[in-house]
């Protein structure tokens, strides 16, 4: 038994152009948290196996808000170690999966939203009881720096935590450098001494004299990075400074294949051969299985028919994404009809209906012809189980509640200015024109004869008296109609207002819960 410990040192944009400035989306601040998954073995099958050695989730980090114009810093991280206890022997070789998750804290109604920002998968060798191993990994445009170690918990000891150690009654009998320990016996033994000079950081030993290198390191003392230990197989002109061949540019330079995929060049492009459990153009899709618990927010995980096929998360209402990590903006589907206000309460949707409408989606129009639903002098026309309003001049919309803009079509000719009135419109004509729509040019001798009269209503205009009469009659009719409509509407709406008040009270309780 023992504990695997992971310490995240930094997470931030990687070097080079195109690095992201912020982990947060445009919707506002966010914070990070990490998930670690451990799988035994270094075999290619490891990708499909569950987190058999265990998994852990970090606390949420401090809230991060991007500062405009400021350089993108390393992001604030959660405090403390991620610890993954293991019950059985430490395997020595294992796969380490670290996921960086983003929790968005913007104006999401009903709580934060989660999304997977980066995932690194690395196969490693590590002896329990050894020193911290440091690592730097890139995941897309992000860079993650971390350290990890495995340590045994007494009475287990050794590089695999398989030997049991129990204190002697007289431990002083053990000499310097020896400890009271043995497989189920009381005797002293020395811990294995690695090869002299073996790197504390990149090497370890399970037997005396060994210097076994962690992945990526080589040499008798594990001091040489694998990438620099050989210059074979590279293309291009020879370098006089190192004696190595310097590679020319090629589609596989920098190895675009993720997760241990191998790159092979094709004409003008590249092809990745992925290890089992990874797929995609760049092997970027991980063969995580349901055993890894990949579905968030109560999503139901269903495994594929064969080991190579991916899991599927069936998300509960309100969540979407391959891991159910995204909260659905269900209001974006505009479920509330007739101008109703949509509220996503997380477990349910509510529509706040405009006056005159009701129902779960505001689909019921309370104004039918029986209730004289057409406002502003409009007349109700029934038909086909519905109704429509034939609106009076100057009004429009479903119930004639919207003031129509008769000037929208620019009816006044020759630069005349349009004014909307209850009766329709009036044109104020430019100098030199007259008529209801300023369509008639004025004779030159009449231009200065009537300067004081309002434009468009000139003394010589034969329509003047008719227009004034029409306006007076229409205004009187409209005022009378409005009075009748208001009285009848007050009676009819009283009962619905009670229901509205009751519904709003329920909604407030749900939002506060």
């Amino acid at each position: 038994a023992g504990v695997f410990e992971l310490q995240i040192h930094s997470f931030g944009p990687g070097p080079g152009p195109g690095a992201p400035r912020s982990p947060c989306s445009a919707r506002g601040p966010c914070r990070l948290f990490f998930r670690v998954c451990l799988k035994p073995g270094l075999s290619e099958e490891a990708a499909e196996s569950p987190c058999a050695l265990g998994a852990a989730l970090s606390a949420r980090g401090p809230v991060y808000t991007e500062q405009p114009e400021a350089p993108a810093p390393d992001l604030p991280l959660p405090n403390g170690l991620l610890q993954v206890p293991f019950r059985d022997a430490w395997p020595g070789t294992f796969s380490l999966i670290i996921e960086t998750w983003r929790e968005e804290l913007g104006d999401q109604i009903g709580g934060p939203a989660w999304s997977l920002l980066a995932r690194v998968t690395r196969r490693r060798r590590l002896a329990a009881g050894g020193p911290w191993a440091r690592d730097i990994q890139r995941a897309g445009a992000w860079e993650l720096r971390f350290s990890y170690r495995a340590r045994c918990e007494l009475p287990a000891v050794g590089t695999a935590c398989t030997r049991l150690c129990r204190p002697r009654s007289a431990p002083s009998r053990c000499g310097p450098g020896l400890r009271p320990c043995a497989p189920l016996e009381d005797e002293c033994e020395a811990p294995p001494v690695c090869r002299a000079g073996c790197s504390l950081e990149h090497g370890f030993c399970e037997q005396p004299g060994e210097c076994r290198c962690l992945e990526g390191w080589t040499g008798p003392l594990c001091m040489v990075p694998v990438s620099t230990s050989s210059c074979l197989g590279l293309r291009g002109p020879s370098s006089t400074t190192t004696g190595c061949l310097v590679p020319g540019p090629g589609p596989c330079d920098g190895n675009p294949c993720a997760n241990g995929g191998s790159c092979s060049e094709t004409p003008g492009s590249f092809e990745c051969t992925c290890p089992r459990g990874f797929y995609g153009l760049r092997c970027e899709v991980s063969g995580v299985t349901c055993a890894d618990g990949p579905c968030f927010n109560g999503g139901l995980c269903v495994g594929g028919a064969d080991p190579d096929s991916a899991y599927i998360c069936h998300c509960p209402p309100g969540f979407q994404g391959s891991n159910c990590e995204k909260r659905v903006d269900r209001c974006s589907l505009q479920p509330c009809r007739n101008g109703g206000l949509c509220l996503d309460l997380g477990h349910a949707l509510r529509c706040r209906c405009r006056a005159g409408f009701a129902g779960p989606r505001c689909e019921h129009d309370l104004d039918d012809c029986a209730g004289r639903a057409c406002a502003n002098g409009g007349t109700c026309v029934e038909g086909g189980g519905a109704h429509r309003c034939s609106c009076a001049l100057g009004f429009g919309g479903r119930n004639c509640r919207e003031r129509a803009d008769p000037c929208a079509a620019r009816p006044c000719a020759h630069g005349g200015r349009c004014y909307a009135h209850f009766s329709g419109l009036v044109c104020a004509c430019a100098p030199g024109y007259m008529g209801a729509r300023c369509e008639f040019p004025v004779h030159p001798d009449g231009v200065s004869a009537l300067p004081a009269a309002p434009p468009g209503l000139r003394p010589g205009d034969p329509q003047r008296a008719g227009v004034i009469a029409v306006i007076v009659v229409v205004v009187i009719a409209i005022v009378a109609g409005i009075v009748v409509l208001v009285i009848s509407r007050k009676k009819r709406m009283a009962k619905y207002e009670k229901a509205e008040i009751k519904e709003m009270g329920e909604m407030h309780r749900e939002l506060n819960a």
Partner: antibody, heavy 119, light 107 residues
Framework: QVQLQQSGTELMKPGASVKLSCKAT????????IEWVKQRPGHGLEWIGE????????QYNEKFKGKATFTADPSSNTAYMQLSSLTTEDSAIYYC????????????WGQGTTLTVSS | DVQITQSPSYLAASPGETITINCRAS??????LAWYQEKPGKTNKLLIY???TLHSGIPSRFSGSGSGTDFTLTISSLEPEDFAIYYC?????????FGGGTKLELK
């Protein structure tokens, strides 16, 4: 004290094989690498490879793969190097040495075995 | 492979003098270079390891310096028993390689 005692001079025919020995005393044999080094006049010292007796782990110089084979017998504290398909190029002094317990180098050497390959 | 160039190949000096022998690696080997002394009829002797660490039992007139690619063995105030062949060896990466040797002769 630590000592590495090597087998005596060998005179071999081309095409034959020979097994050189290196007996260790004065320390725990299994915990230190035994190194093998070739010395020819005008060629200086050449590292052939190494073996960790406790585990049998070996490392070879690519140049000597197929030529040299290392084994170790912890019961007799003896390391062996077998050289196969001998040619006159294999004529040399062969040394065994110990990689130190606390010293990052060869802290003890054998006296050397002279191999002569001649028809 | 890491090539080790040792110079000079021959060096004549007198007792009491100070001499230096150089080894240059074809690429960085950090500090992992050792110096050995070879004398007829005796087993090879480790003098310096990790570039500059004096092995136990070796007189303090022997000293080593350098890291990366350039290393130096200095013997100050030569004694008669110091006339021998000296080799350097890198043990940073496989295959381990030796310098060509320097024969220190009595002038």
């Amino acid at each position: 004290q630590v000592q590495l005692q090597q087998s005596g001079t060998e005179l071999m025919k081309p095409g034959a094989s020979v097994k050189l020995s290196c007996k260790a005393t004065g320390y725990t044999f299994t915990g230190n690498w035994i190194e093998w080094v070739k010395q020819r006049p005008g060629h200086g010292l050449e590292w052939i490879g190494e073996i960790l007796p406790g585990t049998g782990s070996t490392q070879y110089n690519e140049k000597f793969k197929g030529k040299a084979t290392f084994t170790a017998d912890p019961s007799s504290n003896t390391a062996y190097m077998q050289l196969s398909s001998l040619t006159t190029e294999d004529s040399a002094i062969y040394y065994c040495a110990r990689w130190g317990s606390t010293v990052v180098a060869y802290d003890y050497w054998g006296q050397g075995t002279t191999l002569t390959v001649s028809s | 492979d890491v090539q080790i160039t040792q110079s000079p190949s021959y060096l004549a000096a007198s007792p009491g003098e100070t001499i230096t022998i150089n080894c240059r690696a074809s690429k960085s080997i950090s500090k992992y270079l050792a110096w050995y002394q070879e004398k007829p009829g005796k087993t090879n002797k480790l003098l310096i390891y990790s570039g500059s660490t004096l092995h136990s039992g070796i007189p303090s007139r022997f000293s080593g310096s350098g890291s990366g690619t350039d290393f130096t063995l200095t013997i100050s105030s030569l004694e008669p028993e110091d006339f021998a062949i000296y080799y350097c060896q890198q043990h940073n990466e496989y295959p381990l390689t030796f310098g060509g040797g320097t024969k220190l002769e009595l002038k």
